[in-house]
Interface confidence: low
């Protein structure tokens, strides 16, 4: 390696710096890692400036243009850019990152001592979105509308109600409204609402990183915006999924299978959707929602394409005024474009400045909202499509996916099987359950065009080997090929064992390292119920009595006496609706008293023993902490 005049001392600094930025330890710095570095370093820089610096570093540093910076390239950046502003800012960010790491919180889930800058643009965008979403909700009248130009938002989230409502808008029925404390709030009932919000956010797949109820109560901007973005994004992306929106099949390209389309992430589908309409308009395609949309021209043509044409009953035509395209000034052009978006009811998330600066997060939200309102796609007729392949994910699959995402796996899991086909997510889950992974044996993306699947298969083989030899899982008849090909039954068998071990590990940590198994949990449940003089008990996680949810509800009341309002429950001769009603209340109440429950109400009603086990284990963890 040509090291030029790098001293040994500087070399050491560079290696340390590189290791700090290369957070996934794969030996390369990615665009996201650079972005995260600047976020974590909380330099007093606006979001767009961070973006510019990151893009500049990637452009100048990534010499072989493979989308990542190697250690050699990293040295050249530092050397070649020593005197430039970009390099100075980069160095400052790296030095600051150390400072942040060195300051730890005192509470178990807090970020005490860390300072973070936050995006005014995001605050402005989210406030306007929430105001619109909750404008008619009587429970939010005490805070809505919020002023986007003040700190209203950070005060408004403090009692947990707005967060609970936004979670329910993103994934309906996540939280049972009966469990939200709404009147005469006290510090204790506020704490319950925040528990409910945080644990429910986790259950829908939000990565709730060292963020506790205290942080929300104090309205810490960086954490509040981070959580809200995840909640809003999950809602915006909910229908950008083939099995829930068959018209997306119109985006199939020549020679592509349905399976190929189903593997795309919501972001990739949105980009393809935008380009589909831009092609129809005879315009250039875009490759991102940042630099490529800065001039508003793509947006103009997209609006023109998706605007109602008057051919649908009850939907009047909207003719987009394209004259703003002639504006010389970018900001003016963006403003004219947004005025047209407003005519469609889609002026959301971005200001003209956000468009011109190419704010990737807010532009993504703008496009997603436009898609949800005006997809302008038609399910293709007479196409030779295997509609049977379009089945959506099962509840169990969704639960597993949400669990993984809440742990912060990277990349995010959008499609359970195809996103696990290279086992990278599985390796991260092994680390979460303290099974050491030899990352030198792991092939990392980008995979070569030729032989890429072989690399993925090698990873899958190693993942199965780790499961058998290190984790001591029961993986009889499971091979790497099954993970690689997305064999449902066999992949789920591994994922379940990962989730089970994760759950038991947490229990063992609370219990001072004592081993825990199903019998111990069942005994603890029955003992706790007996001590609290409750009449219910369970014989196993398959006990039919669990379908009423009464053992779960009694256990919650035993852990936190007086928490369950039994007047809301049906206790005898329950029909299916009444069972579901009890179960919804039980799952939300479990989260409200602080248990991070991923299971769904239906899991209780149907007595799904796997998920039932996780519910009781989480409650046991909560009950043991109390002691």
């Amino acid at each position: 390696m040509a090291r030029g005049s790098v001293s040994d001392e500087e070399m050491m600094e560079l290696r340390e710096a590189f290791a700090k930025v290369d957070t996934d330890g794969n030996g390369y710095i990615s665009f996201n890692e650079l972005n995260d570095l600047f976020k974590a370093a909380c330099l007093p820089l606006p979001g767009y400036r961070v973006r510019e610096i990151t893009e500049n570093l990637m452009a100048t540093g990534d010499l072989d243009q493979d989308g990542r910076i190697s250690f050699d390239e990293f040295i050249k950046i530092f050397h070649g850019l020593k005197s430039t502003d970009v390099a100075k800012t980069f160095r400052k960010a790296i030095n600051k990152k150390e400072g942040i790491c060195a300051i730890g919180g005192t509470s178990e889930q807090s970020s005490v001592g860390t300072q973070h800058s936050y995006s005014e643009e995001e605050k402005y965008a989210f406030v306007n979105w929430i105001n619109k979403a909750l404008e008619n909700d009587p429970d939010c009248r005490h805070v809505i509308p919020m002023n986007p130009n003040t700190n209203d938002l950070f005060n408004a989230v403090g009692d947990g109600i707005v967060l609970c409502k936004m979670i329910n808008l993103s994934v309906p029925d996540t939280i049972d409204e009966r469990t939200i404390n709404k009147k005469k709030l006290t510090p204790f009932t506020i704490q319950e609402n925040l528990n409910l919000a945080l644990n429910s956010a986790s259950a829908i797949g939000c990565h709730v990183v060292n963020i506790g109820a205290e942080d929300l109560k104090e309205g810490k901007p960086y954490l509040v915006l981070g959580l809200l973005w995840q909640v809003i994004k999950i809602g915006l992306f909910a229908d950008i999924e083939l099995s829930r929106n068959e018209a997306l099949i119109a985006l199939l390209r020549e020679g592509e299978s349905l399976e190929d389309l189903m593997k795309l992430s919501p972001e990739e589908l949105l980009l393809r959707w935008a380009n589909y309409h831009l092609e129809n308009a005879g315009c250039n395609k875009i490759g991102n929602f940042s630099t490529d949309i800065k001039d508003s021209k793509a947006y103009y043509h997209l609006l023109e394409q998706v605007a109602p044409k008057g051919d649908e009953e009850g939907v009047p035509a909207v003719v987009i005024d394209m004259s703003g395209l002639r504006e010389k000034d970018d900001i003016q052009r963006a403003e004219c474009m947004l005025q047209q978006a407003e005519r469609l009811g889609c002026r959301q998330f971005v200001t003209a400045t956000d468009v011109v600066r190419g704010n990737p997060k807010l532009n993504l939200a703008f496009i997603a909202n436009l898609f949800n309102r005006y997809p302008a796609l038609h399910k293709p007729e007479n196409q030779d499509i295997d509609w049977g392949a379009l089945e959506g994910e099962t509840r169990e699959e969704r639960t597993f996916r949400n669990w993984m995402n809440s742990l912060g796996v990277n990349p995010r899991v959008n499609h359970l099987y195809s996103d696990l086909s290279d086992a990278l997510v599985i390796f991260q889950l092994y680390e979460k359950i303290k099974v050491p992974v030899d990352w030198n044996r792991v092939n990392k993306p980008p995979y070569p065009k030729l032989g890429g699947n072989m690399k993925k298969l090698e990873n899958c083989n190693y993942a199965v080997e780790l499961g058998k030899n290190q984790a001591k899982f029961s993986l009889v008849g499971i091979g790497g090929q099954d993970l690689n090909e997305g064999n449902r039954t066999l992949t789920l068998a591994l994922i379940w064992q990962l989730m089970r071990r994760y759950t038991l590990n947490i229990l063992e940590e609370i219990g001072g390292g004592q081993k825990v198994n199903d019998d111990i949990i069942v005994n603890w449940v029955n003992e706790t119920l007996r001590e609290a003089k409750k009449s219910s008990s369970i014989s196993s996680f398959k006990d039919p009595k669990i379908s009423t949810s009464l053992p779960v509800l009694d256990l919650i009341d035993a852990i936190q006496p007086g928490s369950i309002n039994y007047d809301l429950l049906k206790t005898e001769n329950l029909n299916d609706d009444e069972k579901l009603n009890n179960a919804k209340y039980a799952i939300s109440m479990a989260r409200k008293i602080g248990a991070r429950v991923y299971a769904l109400p239906e899991d209780l009603v149907e007595v799904n023993p796997k998920m039932v086990m996780t519910v009781f284990a989480c409650l046991m963890g909560k009950g043991m902490k109390r002691v």
Partner: nanobody
Framework: QVQLQESGGGLVQPGGSLRLSCAAS????????MGWYRQAPGKQREMVAI???????YYGDFVKGRFTASRDDAKNTWNLEMTNLKPEDTAVYYC???????????????WGQGTQVTVSR
């Protein structure tokens, strides 16, 4: 309170080998980047090896293939296998790690007290 404790230092002849270990104690969930550093009398502290959380390892230029760093995250212990030692390797060797005490918690910047390694006839 998290603590790191090095062990395995001592007196060794040139060309000999030593195995340093570092054990973390206290409430630990996981360790991110960990490293070995050394400081010779009158000199600045220098990096010996860094193991990033993904397992990617970096070595100081003077190592030249003589040392091997490894980590056992299940036991929260880290080792530095040193072979073909030279008199200029004489120094106090320190263990360092960024440690999380809870799942997804903040990273604590943690140093050990150091262990003396002397390479001499």
């Amino acid at each position: 309170q998290v603590q790191l404790q090095e062990s395995g230092g001592g007196l060794v002849q040139p060309g000999g080998s030593l195995r340093l270990s570092c054990a973390a104690s206290g409430s630990i969930f996981s360790a991110s980047t960990m490293g070995w550093y050394r400081q010779a009398p009158g000199k600045q502290r220098e990096m010996v090896a860094i193991i990033a959380s993904g397992g990617f390892t970096y070595y100081g230029d003077f190592v030249k293939g003589r040392f091997t760093a490894s980590r056992d995250d299940a036991k929260n212990t880290w080792n530095l296998e040193m072979t073909n030692l030279k008199p200029e390797d004489t120094a106090v060797y320190y263990c360092h790690a960024f440690i999380r005490t809870v799942v997804d918690g903040p990273l604590y910047n943690t140093w050990g007290q150091g262990t003396q390694v002397t390479v001499s006839r």
